[in-house]
């Protein structure tokens, strides 16, 4: 569900939303750390209705959700939750 990508691309997100999306409607979360052409951290959410949205990393709900996912990943090893793709 939660993925971290290190890319050499510029910023992917033109607009960010802080609107709450319950986890039941989320298919995948992609985290793009700042650097490599983009000065900010970006979070991209793929929803179960096939739409995609960029989420404000400061939104409280996404911070809470990522914490839950991190806890879940640490208790359900060996299934990886963080995937690092180095170009």
């Amino acid at each position: 569900v939660l993925e971290v990508y290190y890319t050499s691309l510029r910023c992917r997100c033109v607009q960010e939303s802080s609107v709450f999306i319950p986890r039941r409607f989320i298919d995948r979360i992609q985290i793009l750390p700042r650097g490599n052409g983009c000065p900010r951290k970006e979070i991209i959410v793929w929803k179960k209705n096939k739409s995609i949205v960029c989420v404000d990393p400061q939104a409280e709900w996404i911070q809470r959700m990522m914490e839950v996912l991190r806890k879940r990943s640490s208790s359900t090893l060996p299934v990886p939750v963080f995937k690092r793709k180095i170009p």
Partner: antibody
Framework: EVQLVESGGGLVQPGGSLRLSCAAS????????MSWVRQAPGKGLEWVAT????????YYPDNVKGRFTISRDNAKNSLYLQMNSLRAEDTAVYYC????????????????WGQGTLVTVSS | DIQMTQSPSSLSASVGDRVTITCKAS??????IAWYQQKPGKAPKLLIH???TLQPGVPSRFSGSGSGTDFTFTISSLQPEDFATYYC????????FGGGTKLEIK
């Protein structure tokens, strides 16, 4: 007091269409996602559709995807379910339910439900 | 899709009894389970969400526990008004209801 009142049910032939409505009151309708859940006679509950508070996102299970469309009119405090290509197995009581609070971050499920409207698909 | 296996499907008990209903998820749903009560001809009523959080106004004789895939709903001392059908609902990944448990008077 939260109130949800469904209407629009009735008898329809297989392949036909029907539009259900749900009138909401007693809460800020535009701040909540809304759902439809159905119950076939003598059977259990089955989720049918959910729409986000602003109406921009809709979600469906595979068995109704492409046939049913959920929509809302926040100015009228109303929720709708357009049902096309109806089948005998769509026969059920259809409930409208209040879902998660769109402006929050608590992942809570459907809390208030209407009394339901009966849809019968038969020739 | 996540399946929710609820058991038993029916249960006979007496006023004052302690009653337990279980729901097993086909995969990890964390604590995202809710429990509903439904009486004949009526709409379902939410009793518990997030495994163990009681809705306002719901009596403390109702409780829930579990995490991951195995969940339990308990009525500590049955009251006459508790005879109804109970459903679990997972809301971790879309929505799936359990098949229901009809609680009848012995």
């Amino acid at each position: 007091e939260v109130q949800l009142v469904e209407s629009g049910g009735g008898l329809v032939q297989p392949g036909g269409s029907l539009r259900l409505s749900c009138a909401a009151s007693g809460f800020t309708f535009s701040s909540y996602a809304m759902s439809w859940v159905r119950q076939a006679p003598g059977k259990g509950l089955e989720w049918v559709a959910t729409i986000s508070d602003g109406g921009s996102d809709a979600y469906y299970p595979d068995n109704v995807k492409g046939r049913f469309t959920i929509s809302r009119d926040n100015a009228k405090n109303s929720l709708y379910l357009q049902m096309n290509s109806l089948r005998a197995e769509d026969t059920a009581v259809y409930y409208c339910a209040r879902d998660y609070y769109g402006s929050g971050y608590e992942d809570s499920p459907m809390d208030y439900w209407g009394q339901g409207t009966l849809v019968t698909v038969s020739s | 899709d996540i399946q929710m296996t609820q058991s038993p499907s029916s249960l006979s008990a007496s006023v004052g009894d302690r009653v337990t209903i279980t729901c097993k998820a086909s995969q990890d749903i964390n604590k995202y389970i809710a429990w509903y009560q439904q009486k004949p001809g009526k709409a379902p009523k939410l009793l518990i969400h997030y495994t163990s959080t009681l809705q306002p106004g719901v009596p403390s004789r109702f409780s829930g526990s579990g995490s991951g895939t195995d969940f339990t709903f308990t009525i500590s001392s049955l009251q006459p008004e508790d005879f109804a059908t109970y459903y679990c609902l997972q809301y971790d990944n879309l929505y799936t209801f359990g098949g229901g448990t009809k609680l009848e008077i012995k």
